[in-house]
Interface confidence: low
Amino acid sequence: TIPPHVQKSVNNDMIVTDNNGAVKFPQLCKFCDVRFSTCDNQKSCMSNCSITSICEKPQEVCVAVWRKNDENITLETVCHDPKLPYHDFILEDAASPKCIMKEKKKPGETFFMCSCSSDECNDNIIFSEEYNTSNPDLLLVIFQ
């Protein structure tokens, strides 16, 4: 079996708190960077990433990026600070407990990205239209 794996290390000089002043500790995300994927034309996919990482920056969330071009499909799984753009896009759905893929405009490829704020939430990426922002579950802000 493959042994336990990779940790991205990021700067952090602050403690993040929720609205009640409780310390928000780093969450767990799938973190395989960019890997080839067989996920295509499905309502949802598992990341098939065996790497579970602690996001060392407490405000970081889980992110998944699905890209398809003429040659291949890749899935990127990382931790990222939602205050900062990722692939030049703002993480608009960072408070969601589920990773709901949204298409972004990128020349020469099909590009979907999602972000979420529950442990290992980028392990299950969802493309289905039935999930949308009117779903009350997606409005939950999960504080670790």
């Epitope: 794996h5 990779v6 940790q7 290390s9 700067n11 403690i15």
Partner: antibody
């Protein structure tokens, strides 16, 4: 068996350069973040730098920022530390270490090399 | 950066003694606290991670406790091979800072 073997240490004059290497074996190198930690003679441990498994993310201690560069060659299972503009205070044993990688062990360095001594002196 | 303060800086003990070393963080680090043992001329060795989890292969006489800012490493019955320097390290944020070390010497 996990093994980390450092090399490249030695005596160098202030302002000089040195490149340390760390040969890794016994584990899937490219999916582990790796760190350099140093220890001045008779002193405690000081974290120097970290690089992610893919090599795409690097961070440095303020004391070495702009002078040291961490890198890795995953095809050779080797970690590097390029040290430029060396100062007397950089004199230390330099250890390469693997960051453990499962949930809470993620921040801990679970395997260390034997270290290589860097002496900066005129 | 988060400062880590260990106490005492050194202690003398006999084989069979119960030894306690404390580590205090300058801010809350949850359970992101690791303990290492280092013998002269050797590399550090991971003993405890996540404040209380025993690293594989480490004798059960070593234990860790604490969360937030205050942590403890306990050796329940000191053995001859335990005379060494012990370091705490926080891995809550980068840079992952170390304590200054506690040297355990033979009385």
């Amino acid at each position: 068996e996990v093994q980390l073997v450092e090399s490249g240490g030695g005596l160098v004059q202030p302002g000089g350069s040195l490149r340390l290497s760390c040969a890794a074996s016994g584990f899937y190198f490219d999916i582990y973040a790796m760190t350099w930690v140093r220890q001045a003679p008779g002193k405690g441990l000081e974290w120097v730098s970290v690089i992610s498994g893919s090599g795409g993310t690097t961070y440095y201690a303020d004391s070495v920022k702009g002078r040291f560069t961490i890198s890795r060659d995953n095809s050779k299972n080797t970690l590097y530390l390029q040290m430029n503009s060396l100062r007397a205070e950089d004199t230390a044993v330099y250890y390469c270490a693997r960051r453990g990688q499962y949930r809470h062990i993620a921040g801990a360095t679970d395997y260390w090399g034997q270290g290589t001594l860097v002496t900066v002196s005129s | 950066d988060i400062q880590m303060t260990q106490s005492p800086s050194s202690l003398s003990a006999s084989v069979g003694d119960r030894v306690t070393i404390t580590c205090r963080a300058s801010q809350s680090i949850s359970s992101y606290l690791n303990w290492y043992q280092q013998k002269p001329g050797k590399a550090p060795k991971l003993l405890i991670y996540a404040a209380s989890s025993l690293q594989s292969g480490v004798p059960s006489r070593f234990s860790g406790s604490g969360s937030g800012t205050d942590f403890t490493l306990t050796i329940s019955s000191l053995q001859p091979e335990d005379f060494a320097t012990y370091y705490c390290q926080q891995s809550y944020s980068t840079p992952p800072t170390f304590g200054q070390g506690t040297k355990v010497e033979i009385k």
